[in-house]
């Protein structure tokens, strides 16, 4: 019986350990600034690091600029987006800016895109100051299905701060769907 | 066999309960405003409450102004920093301000400090308004090793809002490292 | 013994599954804009969706404009509040605004209300720009007891963005209380 109990315990430890790790996908993706679009309109950001510095991914997939869910569940999603301008970068085309982020979910089965979270601010970045900075943070708890894709859209992408501590987004699974 | 099963169940409940609690360190630290540095430069904030009001800590350590990790894992880190100024506090040295927060990680083994997250905004706090306020929120998911230290740096510390609901930071463990 | 082991395994799977789901209440509530108070003063927002679009709730209760905790635990709480104004909506009564959010906890046993988190900014929304926008995000980790209630207060409610991706708050349980 002891051997049997040890076996039960052992198999349970394995099962618990395995299921726990399998049950907790996560990603923290940081901006890849080598390929930021030039316009001031709303664009989808497709270049992110997933395996350098603070960037990491597990049990999720990063492909074509989108974070793909591999496991159904309830996830906490977050994004931090920093914009900055220094006068040495040139004159702004307009001093009245809409600095915005949109965290969107796309379902491949039903090819449609929906905004889960948005944030930002209108700003007046006058020439009186040599440096301007602004950060947005959004976060929320969402049901995600395997195959669904998370992407980030921003306005004024050429104003993005390219540091890994500045512009990033991520997700971690909190619990299964009942 | 029933007794054996009960023993298995009992030991498992203990193990599950114990491992679950051990696996989930957390901290929520609120600003201790009795010792906020003056000046407008970037400073590390070292005075935080860990055991009064909303402040709490478990399976982590607060020492020398830093939140010390006791258990390897992936943690969600967050910070909320509020700045405020009322004209009764006197005139600002400059109306153009950089109100910033930096969440940094220090490794004692490799004595180096790295910024995990940053946020904030440049602000024009003109004398036309008698009161000014601004809050920053940042959050992200990071791998932390035992012995690593989390600290908070801000610009313009003398403008910090000293309320426990305004200026705080924290962490909670989400999952083990594989 | 094999049958006994299978029974142990089976009961454990049930127990693990059940306890895991029971242990993880959550809510994500989105603004119901059909009933937003007017005025610029601080008001409690009582109209939220809990079962349409991104809004959802499990093992928590939404009643009388408050999110009620049904299960003791440590929860991560968050809120995202967006304010906006377009010149077509008419002239603002004042161009100097305090756009604020307060996440409060009320205990019925001890009838008192406490602010857990606050955030926001003073803004100058001048007539030079036809559109203004600003978002606030706050989040933190708190011990909540069964029966306690979470509510949201904002200033300038008539400026709230009514989109479900813009103005929402939520909570999810991270761990039990020891």
């Amino acid at each position: 019986i002891r051997a049997e109990k040890a076996m039960v315990d052992g198999s349970w430890l394995d099962l618990a350990k395995r299921s726990k790790l399998e049950a907790q996908p996560f990603a923290h993706l940081t901006i890849n600034a080598t390929d930021i679009p030039s316009g001031s309109h709303k664009v989808s950001l497709s270049s992110w690091y997933h395996d350098r510095g603070w960037a990491k991914i597990s049990n999720m997939t990063f492909s074509n600029g989108k974070l793909i869910v591999n496991q159904d569940g309830f996830y906490y999603l977050y994004a931090n987006i920093c914009f900055r301008h220094h006068e040495t970068s040139g004159d702004l085309a307009t001093e009245y800016l809409q600095l915005m982020v949109y965290v969107t979910k796309t379902s491949i089965k039903i090819p449609s895109s929906h905004t889960l979270m948005k944030g930002g601010s209108t700003k007046y970045w006058s020439g009186n100051s040599e440096f301007h900075f602004y950060s947005i943070n959004v976060g929320g708890f969402f049901k995600l299905r395997s195959g669904e894709e998370i992407s980030i859209e921003v306005s004024n992408p050429s104003l993005l701060d390219p540091d890994q501590d500045a512009t990033y987004f991520g997700a971690f699974k909190v619990r299964d769907i009942d | 066999i029933r007794a054996e099963k009960a023993m298995v169940d009992g030991s498992w409940l203990d193990l599950a309960k114990r491992s679950k609690l051990e696996a989930q360190p957390f901290a929520h630290l609120t600003i201790n405003a009795t010792d906020i540095p003056s000046g407008s430069h970037k400073v590390s904030l070292s005075s935080w409450y860990h055991d009064r009001g909303w402040a709490k800590i478990s399976n982590m350590t607060f020492s020398n102004g830093k939140l010390i990790v006791n258990q390897d894992g992936f943690y969600y880190l967050y910070a909320n920093i509020c700045f405020r100024h009322h004209e009764t506090s006197g005139d600002l040295a400059t109306e153009y301000l950089q109100l910033m927060v930096y969440v940094t990680k220090t490794s004692i083994k490799i004595p180096s400090s790295h910024t995990l997250m940053k946020g904030g905004s440049t602000k024009y706090w003109s004398g036309n308004s008698e009161f000014h306020f601004y809050s920053i929120n940042v959050g992200g998911f990071f791998k932390l090793r035992s012995g690593e230290e989390i600290s908070i740096e801000v610009s313009n510390p003398s403008l910090l809002d000293p309320d426990q609901d305004a200026t705080y930071f924290g962490a909670f463990k989400v999952r083990d490292i594989d | 013994i094999r049958a006994e082991k299978a029974m142990v395994d089976g009961s454990w799977l049930d127990l693990a599954k059940r306890s895991k789901l029971e242990a993880q209440p959550f809510a994500h509530l989105t603004i119901n804009a059909t009933d937003i108070p007017s005025g610029s003063h601080k008001v409690s927002l009582s109209s939220w969706y809990h079962d349409r679009g991104w809004a959802k709730i499990s093992n928590m209760t939404f009643s009388n404009g408050k999110l009620i905790v049904n299960q003791d635990g440590f929860y991560y709480l968050y809120a995202n509040i967006c304010f906006r104004h377009h010149e077509t909506s008419g002239d603002l009564a004042t161009e100097y605004l305090q756009l604020m959010v307060y996440v409060t906890k009320t205990s019925i046993k001890i009838p008192s209300s406490h602010t857990l988190m606050k955030g926001g900014s003073t803004k100058y929304w001048s007539g030079n720009s036809e559109f203004h926008f600003y978002s606030i995000n706050v989040g933190g980790f708190f011990k909540l007891r069964s029966g306690e209630e979470i509510s949201i207060e904002v200033s300038n409610p008539s400026l709230l963005d009514p989109d479900q991706d813009a103005t929402y708050f939520g909570a999810f349980k991270v761990r039990d209380i020891d």
């Epitope: 030039s38 316009g39 001031s40 309109h41 664009v43 970068s89 040139g90 004159d91 702004l92 085309a93 307009t94 001093e95 009245y96 004024n156 050429s158 104003l159 | - | -």
Partner: antibody
Framework: QVQLVQSGGGVVHPGRSLRLSCAAS????????MHWVRQAPGKGLEWVAV????????YYADSVKGRFTISRDNSKDTLYLQMNSLRPEDTAVYYC????????WGYGMDVWGQGTTVTVSS | DIQMTQSPSTLSASVGDRVTITCRAS??????LAWYQQKPGKAPKLLIY???SLESGVPSRFSGSGSGTEFTLTISSLQPDDFATYYC?????????FGQGTKVEIK
């Protein structure tokens, strides 16, 4: 593909008016500033006017200030140049051109229209 | 307004030659300079922006350098398709001006 198609040129008498149009396609028009540049017969390029992506900022060459007005309709993806009080020296091929950067001035003009001829003659 | 002076006005060269065109600004414009190529009856084409950045799709034989008041466009090995007129264009404080042009013709 990315293109700018111009229309509205022609022959006019001095002192009269003309409106040039430039229809954009293949890119997000509302995200970029737009220029008008002209070239007199056998001469070099002369910058005329620019408008920011949102239409809030407009700048003009001294030679056309007060007479020409640049505008845009982002809902129609179209740029305009209203030319009043035309003079013989305004005779030129007029080009519309897209700013390379939507956010900043100074990065050059990366897409050009085919040009439209304006002749001011009595 | 800032004046832009290109030299030479005309340049005779052969296929394979290394060609350099200079553009001088009447005051400092930092790096806010672009170079264009124009062929007869056609619209100009952007080659270089911000003094030295090569526009997408432009052959690597074209390069730009300089800052402040003195700038150069270099064609490392002249090709038959490169015979055209080249213009520099500056930006400074919400004002744009072009140079008078340099015509590169077959020797």
């Amino acid at each position: 593909q990315v293109q700018l198609v111009q229309s509205g040129g022609g022959v006019v008498h001095p002192g009269r008016s003309l409106r040039l149009s430039c229809a954009a396609s293949g890119f997000t028009f509302s995200g970029y500033g737009m220029h008008w540049v002209r070239q007199a017969p056998g001469k070099g390029l002369e910058w005329v006017a620019v408008i920011s992506y949102d239409g809030t900022n407009k700048y003009y060459a001294d030679s056309v200030k007060g007479r020409f007005t640049i505008s845009r309709d982002n809902s129609k993806d179209t740029l305009y140049l209203q030319m009043n009080s035309l003079r013989p020296e305004d005779t030129a091929v007029y080009y519309c051109a897209k700013c390379l950067s939507g956010t900043y001035w100074g990065y050059g003009m990366d897409v050009w229209g085919q040009g439209t001829t304006v002749t001011v003659s009595s | 307004d800032i004046q832009m002076t290109q030299s030479p006005s005309t340049l005779s060269a052969s296929v394979g030659d290394r060609v350099t065109i200079t553009c001088r600004a009447s005051q400092s414009i930092s790096s806010w300079l672009a170079w264009y190529q124009q062929k007869p009856g056609k619209a100009p084409k952007l080659l270089i922006y911000k003094a030295s950045s090569l526009e997408s799709g432009v052959p690597s034989r074209f390069s730009g350098s300089g800052s402040g008041t003195e700038f150069t466009l270099t064609i490392s090995s002249l090709q038959p398709d490169d015979f055209a007129t080249y213009y520099c264009q500056q930006y400074n404080s919400y004002s744009w001006t072009f140079g008078q042009g340099t015509k590169v013709e077959i020797k």
